[in-house]
Amino acid sequence: SAGAGSHCQKTSLRVNFEDIGWDSWIIAPKEYEAYECKGGCFFPLADDVTPTKHAIVQTLVHLKFPTKVGKACCVPTKLSPISVLYKDDMGVPTLKYHYEGMSVAECGCR
Amino acid sequence: SAGAGSHCQKTSLRVNFEDIGWDSWIIAPKEYEAYECKGGCFFPLADDVTPTKHAIVQTLVHLKFPTKVGKACCVPTKLSPISVLYKDDMGVPTLKYHYEGMSVAECGCR
């Protein structure tokens, strides 16, 4: 798995809705693949982490003044929806095909 | 200034182009305000850090399993352009009014 010493990448993160208290309204699935962005944004920033100009600048400043300025951070840059079955206000089980922004599609340095 | 103990916020970061080796092609300005996103993404994530659903989920999982999953990260969510004077291929000083993505406009938890 990707640790702090490895480069920014998408890693597995299985989330159980019961663990985060969302099982009270999400009926199914019981868990899903959320993914997590892990790893460092090291110089030089590779194309696959789609760095912004600001991230490139911050990386260069960090290289020069590592105690003053932090590195860019490995974060989700594109998210995907999941489908969930939930209870509406009337308690009716309802399917939401596209519950947006729940799963990482891509990671990058920002 | 915002440290790891404070909440995610935009802080000043003056960048000198000579420090990052960009003075070879950027004539002016000599430095600019890039800003930096600093601070933690603590539970509960406030509206002003415009959290995605994934960031909220990750924050909740981190709360439950702090050693297994990291917190969401404080990063630029909106960037602004700056104007730069540079030399073109013919060595002609040319103004680029909108050199995109160089300065932080907003920070958020991702």
């Epitope: - | 004539i27 002016a28 300005p29 000599k30 430095e31 600019y32 700056i82 104007s83 730069v84 004077l85 073109d88 013919m90 002609v92 000083p93 040319t94 103004l95």
Partner: antibody, heavy 119, light 111 residues
């Protein structure tokens, strides 16, 4: 080598017209703003007009002293810029320089051509 | 329009001595941390040539004895050690806004 060569000027009567042209070489003409700058005899430099790039829809700007009388145009396929001068006045007399450059500076200059407006 | 005023109108300096020409703008010609100020040299019978741009940067092929300084409304062109070939008229010019305007020129001669 960058070269800007203006057409020959000449003598014209007040109220008359004249068209100047400028042929460019040695640089990618279509990438640069083109300008006309003039210099009255024994006097200083005065910007007359400029024309921007295709990406700017060939926007033009003129000095107040010539607006409505002079028209700048360009033909990127011929690497040429033109100045159509109508309703000429005696105070339009001077050396007319064709200049190329950016949105910041006059980088390239022609040798200039003398336009004399006199009766 | 931004009015550019140079001083002096003419200047006589001995060979090897320092020459200083000033230029004042009627309003600031700085924006975005950039000075929209250029200097041109015009030798007798020749077209002008870009000397200094962005207040302090030397144009291509310009000798090191030429330098520029200043910001906002006040700018200076300095020739550290005058050479015979420096005899010319020097113009400041702003490109912050249209119409781009020149100073009236400073004629530099040898004393």
């Amino acid at each position: 080598e960058v070269q800007l060569v203006e057409s020959r000027g000449g003598l014209v009567q007040p109220g008359g017209s004249m068209r100047l042209s400028c042929a460019a070489s040695g640089f990618t003409f279509s990438n640069y703003w083109m300008n006309w700058v003039r210099q009255a005899p024994g006097k200083g430099l005065e910007w007359v007009a400029h024309i921007r790039l295709k990406s700017d829809n060939y926007a033009t700007h003129y000095a107040e002293s010539v607006r409505g009388r002079f028209t700048i145009s360009r033909d990127d396929s011929k690497s040429s810029v033109y100045l159509q001068m109508n309703s000429l006045k005696t105070e339009d007399t001077g050396i007319y320089y064709c200049t190329g450059g950016s949105n910041y500076v006059f980088a390239f200059w022609g040798q200039g051509t003398l336009v004399t407006v006199s009766s | 329009d931004i009015v550019m005023t140079q001083s002096p109108d003419s200047l006589a300096v001995s060979l090897g001595e320092r020459a200083t020409i000033n230029c004042r703008a009627s309003e600031s010609v700085d924006n975005y941390g950039i000075s929209f100020m250029n200097w041109y040299q015009q030798k007798p019978g020749q077209p002008p040539k870009l000397l200094i741009y962005a207040a302090s940067n030397q144009g291509s092929g310009v000798p090191d004895r030429f330098s520029g300084s200043g910001s906002g409304t006040d700018f200076t062109l300095t020739i550290s050690s005058l050479q015979a070939e420096d005899v010319a008229v020097y113009y400041c010019q702003q490109s912050k806004e249209v119409p781009w305007t020149f100073g009236q020129g400073t004629k530099l001669e040898i004393k």
